[in-house]
Amino acid sequence: EKAMVDGSWLDLAKRSKLEAQPFAHLTINATDIPSGSHKVSLSSWYHDRGWAKISNMTFSNGKLIVNQDGFYYLYANICFRHHETSGDLATEYLQLMVYVTKTSIKIPSSHTLMKGGSTKYWSGNSEFHFYSINVGGFFKLRSGEEISIEVSNPSLLDPDQDATYFGAFKVRDID
């Protein structure tokens, strides 16, 4: 009986540790996509509707803030699209990029952790264009550090929650 109690206690401990593992999945807020044809920061994301969820991390001022030191897997998926019903592209040669950036408040500094994208030729003869970027990586993050997303040509962002999103989850503690 004692072994059983010990076992279930261990399970509970494991489960509560898992439940405390920080994670976030943030989806684009389509009502507030900034304008610009160069690199801009995307600051408006959902954290609590549809597929979006957050636990033991903080979302504030457009940035995902780390609350616990650890090794995290970071990911971002950005879709760009254009359909002729919305008008014409002013230029057919495009640089479609995403940058995942880490900012430290304690030692004021900013680093690009990941970038992805391509130059594209989106011909005016086509009715529809689409391009998707996915980046992901494993990073040591400290409490208080902030993760943000920058993109080029935000007016071409696909506003669906399954198209434009980013997130993080803690994989293990720092030894």
């Epitope: 254009h82 019903t85 919305s86 008008g87 014409d88 002013a90």
Partner: antibody, heavy 126, light 103 residues
């Protein structure tokens, strides 16, 4: 305030060419596209083409392809539309119009014509 | 190529009347639809963009509605200065126009 001022009326013989100008003021000319639209007597408005005043990129209606040239002079904040091989059916009022999409804020020419020139009557007659 | 069809082609109404003009697209165009007012010898004027947004400086008696393929321009209380021809437009395509006259 934003203004587009077009050149005066023109009379041409069939087969000739005409060049209409559109001088912009009251905004940064290079940040917007200029469209050309015409209206023949008793007909609906007809889109002809646009020019991105910043980079000079152009797009034309299939109907006018090969006969139309649209250029701009950024120093003079002026767009020009030249139509060649004129025929009697080209008799119309020709308008320039500004697209309301600011190219600094995005790269989509949205076809919202927020300011128009006063129109230039081109008469093609033998 | 998308075709825009307006109805009626002309209408006659009294000052103060509510006037409605309809515009149909040959396929769905979301909300990418604009309305213009044309008076003889004057520059055309953008009234409504994006199906329902009122262009600045345009009187509030003008309103637009609709999405997909069917759209409406409404003048809530017709004024003498509203005598003109009205056109709907989606990108490169214009409707054939609706001429509004006073009875």
């Amino acid at each position: 305030q934003v203004q587009l001022v077009q050149s005066g009326a023109e009379v041409r013989k069939p087969g000739a060419s005409v060049k209409v100008s559109c001088k912009a003021s009251g905004y940064d000319f290079s940040n917007y596209a200029i469209h050309w639209v015409r209206q023949a007597p008793g007909q609906r408005l007809e889109w002809m083409g646009w020019i991105n005043a910043g980079n000079g990129n152009t797009k034309f209606s299939q109907k006018f392809q090969g006969r139309i040239t649209v250029t701009r002079d950024t120093a003079a904040s002026t767009a020009y539309m030249e139509l060649r091989s004129l025929r009697s059916e080209d008799t119309a009022v020709y308008y320039c119009a500004r697209d309301n999409s600011n190219m600094v804020r995005g790269i989509i020419i949205a076809y919202y014509f927020d300011y128009w020139g006063q129109g230039t009557l081109v008469t093609v007659s033998s | 190529e998308i075709v825009m069809t307006q109805s009626p082609s002309s209408l006659s109404a009294s000052v103060g009347d509510r006037v409605t003009i309809t515009c149909r697209a040959s396929q769905s165009i979301s909300r990418y639809l604009n309305w213009y007012q044309l008076k003889p010898g004057k520059a055309p004027r953008l009234l409504i963009y994006g199906a329902s947004s009122l262009q600045s400086g345009v009187p509030s008696r003008f309103s637009g509605s609709g999405s997909g393929a069917e759209f409406t321009l409404t003048i809530s209380s017709l004024q003498p200065e509203d005598i003109a021809t009205y056109y709907c437009q989606h990108t490169r395509a214009f409707g054939q126009g609706t001429k509004v006259e006073i009875k």
